[in-house]
């Protein structure tokens, strides 16, 4: 069948990084400048991604493959193919339409992306709350209270692992 | 081709008023959120203000609030920033960019940007 298809349609032999030219007897001829085919056998060429704005260029353009974007400090990729730069904010904000905001008392963001979350409600568990919560971190939840009370085993759970110089506030 | 183009910057005394405006091709400006962005010498870009597709919502930084305000003409595929009282602080390259389908429902992220213009503010 492919060797059919060879004999009656010679697009088909246009490498990628060509075009069938329908102007100049069906040859294949180089993409023109800021233009690429990835694929062989194409009557045309797609035009290169620009990446403009906050877009930053990762991979240039070539005859054979469209350039890549990801976005400029301050922003991060949403989409397939980075299609979309969103704006980051700090630790304990989520963005908003009206900008980054503060995470609401009871929740967090421990990354400069996403939404705030609330706390974990440690008694929902059974445990009781060893370190709390802040606007950039989750609360940390220790043993059930019955765990704490006289009698019971008198061995100490490990101290939660925190950043060097973060103290609970 | 998908393009925003900005224009209306410059040389611009304290107290001045410029107006930049962002003419949009290739697309229906009326279906996308708008937003104004500015990157002041040496900083990271910042966010000014935006819009929603019929005018209704605008919302700004707290440092332009009361000076600078958004709008815009769907008829002529026009997004507008009327700067008033402009100190040397707003000095910076000013960026139109279209907000990506579903723009405050899932996301904030911008899908199209122009190349800016250039405010300057001295005496």
């Known amino acids: 069948f492919e060797r059919t298809r060879s004999l009656q349609d010679p697009c088909s032999n246009c490498p990628a990084g060509t075009f069938c030219d329908n102007n100049r007897n069906q040859i294949c001829s180089p993409c023109p400048p800021n233009s690429f085919s990835s694929a062989g056998g194409q009557r045309t060429c797609d035009i290169c991604r620009q990446c403009k704005g906050v877009f930053r260029t990762r991979k240039e353009c070539s005859s054979t493959s469209n350039a890549e974007c990801d976005c400029t400090p301050g922003f991060h990729c949403l989409g397939a193919g980075c299609s979309m730069c969103e704006q980051d904010c700090k630790q304990g904000q989520e963005l908003t339409k009206k900008g980054c905001k503060d995470c609401c008392f009871g929740t967090f963001n421990d990354q400069k992306r996403g939404i705030c979350r609330p706390w974990t409600n440690c008694s929902l568990d059974g445990k009781s709350v060893l370190v709390n919560g802040t606007k950039e971190r989750d609360v940390v939840c220790g043993p059930s209270p019955a765990d704490l009370s006289p009698g019971a085993s008198s061995v100490t759970p490990p101290a939660p692992a925190r950043e060097p110089g973060h103290s609970p506030q | 081709e998908v393009q925003l183009v900005e224009s209306g910057g410059g040389l611009v005394q304290p107290g001045g008023s410029p107006r930049l405006s962002c003419a949009a091709s290739?697309?229906?400006?009326?279906?996308?959120?708008m937003i104004w962005y500015r990157q002041a010498p040496g900083e990271k870009l910042e966010w000014v203000a935006n819009i929603n597709q019929d005018g209704s919502e605008k919302y700004y930084v707290d440092s332009v609030k009361g000076r600078f305000t958004i709008s815009r003409d769907n008829a002529t595929n026009s997004l507008f920033l009327q700067m008033n009282s402009l100190r040397a602080e707003d000095t910076a390259v000013y960026y139109c960019a279209r907000g990506g389908d579903g723009y405050s429902n899932s996301h904030y992220g911008m899908d199209v940007w122009g190349q800016g213009t250039t405010v300057t503010v001295s005496s």
């Open positions: 290739g697309f229906t400006l009326s279906n996308y959120w």
